[in-house]
Amino acid sequence: RKIPKVGHTFFQKPESCPPVPGGSMKLDIGIINENQRVSMSRNIESRSTSPWNYTVTWDPNRYPSEVVQAQCRNLGCINAQGKEDISMNSVPIQQETLVVRRKHQGCSVSFQLEKVLVTVGCTCVTPVIHHVQ
Amino acid sequence: RKIPKVGHTFFQKPESCPPVPGGSMKLDIGIINENQRVSMSRNIESRSTSPWNYTVTWDPNRYPSEVVQAQCRNLGCINAQGKEDISMNSVPIQQETLVVRRKHQGCSVSFQLEKVLVTVGCTCVTPVIHHVQ
């Protein structure tokens, strides 16, 4: 799913207020809901009919530093016999997410939001048209 | 996938530098990669063997204001005949993502990161145990 553009309103003060100095704003330390948990079914990436693997990318100047990307293992989907069914296709489910980029020069540290496209997993679909013309 | 805890390091300046004043830091306006595109406008949610619907939540004090949540339509998966196969399960694929929460009192505006759990779509899995004993 796509994150809409910021436009020029969300990060600005109300019109009646003095503008934000220097094109930056105040970000409070700490994260709301930091301790919430993901309750994903166990090993769904291996048990799915459109199974996937995970690759971890690491960047110490990004929060979260670890971003996990899924890659579908097959082109087709896995049938009840454990064979690849080529009439169905394993397709990636993608999600735009925000990360925070840290930029520093000496003791001057600033942060900026960054959009990252994450493949979260795969699902099995029926192509609209089965064959080329 | 789970976002690790911030700990006490990412948003802090190096030890040799003066501490961040008032528990806040500088967030630059603008978003890196704002124009990148998601190629997901293909109705996979309807054509998946584990189809899902979308619900949009809206909050003007959150960026992005619109957060889309998926809900699996069925317990089972849809077979080639378009019928629900209850030997297989439709399960949600969840992803922790960051949003920005806006807090304001008069002209004093600050922002804080918030973790949100998003269901991105669904996938069809083989249950670990098919039948109770």
């Epitope: 579908c72 082109l75 296709n89 192509p127 089965h130 064959h131 | 293909r42």
Partner: antibody, heavy 123, light 106 residues
Framework: QVQLVQSGAEVKKPGASVKVSCKAS????????MHWVKQSHGQRLEWMGG????????SYNQNFKGKATLTVDTSASTAYMELSSLRSEDTAVYYC????????????????WGQGTTVTVSS | DIQMTQSPSSLSASVGDRVTITCSAS?????MHWYQQKPGKVPKLLIY???KLASGVPSRFSGSGSGTDFTLTISSLQPEDVATYYC?????????FGQGTKLEIK
């Protein structure tokens, strides 16, 4: 228009490896699968496998598992097929061929073909 | 794997003749494709989904069949039809092709 341009002919010694490239143009590379087909001395066509540049998904013909490795470089819109431990029976013309996008056409539907790359294995 | 057997392996016919090539699958398949490969050229899709004509293919070509037995027919052979014809099953992994039928003009 869609074009698939393959690398030139190769002559290799038994036991060596070879990597054949297929440069795509005229469409969005990431959105379509790429397949590889072997044709030995003008005879039967054998589907070797296919790869989805977007999802990373790969499907191999079991007969070519361990023999062929399919990869892509999305930034260069190029697909690669590497053959290892070459033997005389690997002497053939190898074709890359574009498959479907998985959404509107099936991944396994082949529409456009490269011009073919001749690999000769000889001591 | 599904084995595809074409017959005949080669045939010679006169311009204007009706030509039939058959393809037999080792087990039932839903769809059959037919490819034409002219000497020194790349394969070209001729018929897809058993009976549908691919874009730009002359109407003298037609396909039929179901289950395990499929047929490619050229209603009136033309000199430019000299080629090797391959059937390909699109049903079961892996994709498999027939061994080819080489068509020549008498």
């Amino acid at each position: 228009q869609v074009q698939l341009v393959q690398s030139g002919a190769e002559v290799k010694k038994p036991g060596a490896s070879v990597k054949v490239s297929c440069k795509a143009s005229g469409y969005t590379f990431n959105e379509y699968t790429m397949h590889w087909v072997k044709q030995s001395h003008g005879q039967r066509l054998e589907w070797m496998g296919g790869i989805n540049p977007n999802s990373g998904g790969v499907s191999y013909n079991q007969n070519f598992k361990g023999k062929a490795t399919l990869t892509v470089d999305t930034s260069a819109s190029t697909a690669y097929m590497e053959l290892s431990s070459l033997r005389s029976e690997d002497t053939a013309v190898y074709y890359c061929a574009r498959g479907g996008d998985g959404y509107y056409t099936n991944y396994f539907d082949i529409d456009y073909w490269g011009q073919g790359t001749t690999v000769t294995v000889s001591s | 794997d599904i084995q595809m057997t074409q017959s005949p392996s080669s045939l010679s016919a006169s311009v204007g003749d009706r030509v039939t090539i058959t393809c037999s699958a080792s087990s039932s398949v839903n769809y059959m494709h037919w490819y034409q490969q002219k000497p020194g050229k790349v394969p070209k899709l001729l018929i897809y989904d058993t009976s549908k004509l691919a874009s730009g293919v002359p109407s003298r070509f037609s396909g039929s069949g179901s289950g395990t037995d499929f047929t490619l027919t050229i209603s009136s052979l033309q000199p430019e039809d000299v080629a090797t014809y391959y059937c390909q099953q699109w049903n079961s992994h892996p994709l498999t092709f027939g061994q080819g039928t080489k068509l020549e003009i008498k």
